[in-house]
Interface confidence: medium
Amino acid sequence: QPDAINAAVTCCYNFTNRKISVQRLASYRRITSSKCPKEAVIFKTIVAKEICADPKQKWVQDSMDHLDKQTQTPKT
């Protein structure tokens, strides 16, 4: 779970070690603040749960990629 260290900054201290199905994911945001101990990705699931993940893991990259292309590629 992400931790808010103050109102403006949310950090991840641990990463999930389970791969989450992309069908369960609604969105993500990247954590790159120098106030945080590690760079991270926070996925929000379709049931609004937030999960910290390691951006260097390929399933995380692939999931971000999928979500990006879902929102950025015009639907035909």
Partner: antibody
Framework: QVQLVQSGAEVKKPGSSVKVSCKAS????????MHWVRQAPGQGLEWMGR????????KFDPKFQGRVTITADTSTSTAYMELSSLRSEDTAVYYC??????????WGQGTTVTVSS | DIQMTQSPSSLSASVGDRVTITCKAF??????RAWYQQKPGKAPKLLIH???SLEHGVPSRFSGSGSGTDYTLTISSLQPEDFATYYC?????????FGGGTKVEIK
Amino acid sequence: QVQLVQSGAEVKKPGSSVKVSCKASGLTISHTYMHWVRQAPGQGLEWMGRIDPDNHNTKFDPKFQGRVTITADTSTSTAYMELSSLRSEDTAVYYCARGVFGFFDHWGQGTTVTVSS
Amino acid sequence: DIQMTQSPSSLSASVGDRVTITCKAFEDIYNRRAWYQQKPGKAPKLLIHGATSLEHGVPSRFSGSGSGTDYTLTISSLQPEDFATYYCQQFWSAPYTFGGGTKVEIK
């Protein structure tokens, strides 16, 4: 820290094959994608393809399809790129790189392959 | 393939100058681009990826901007160690493609 160490320079005859290795340390290669990029003398960078070492799925630039084989051995954390039917235009420096999405944050030192009769 | 056109192909500049390199993609790449620096005989080094993400350890004088098909790398105050060749790259879709490079030389 992450390090990618490649095999040494090669001189090959036209029509032959070359196999370049890339040994990774400081990372688990099954958690990442390993890519190969080449650079002909005085030229720009050209992406060749990549492997998912976990399941051996590969993706190539169609330009190299059928001539390049990318493999990986997770037990030794080593990726390999084999290029066959070599011609003089394949003379280049070949780099392995760790892929994040489709960009490359760690690179090997490069392997010079010279194709000459 | 998404073609990436980089300009200029070379430029001469002095230490302290502001330098701008541009890259044009032949279709929208949705900020999926990276910039690399390469010095002779060395492997490329990642500088910037995505919208504005500066790679760890890269000086803040380097910055990236742009959207859609047009992207820019800016060096706010050129330092002696910045004389090198710079490449843009798109990672919106495979095959991943690079610009032709911009060689930054000492004036």
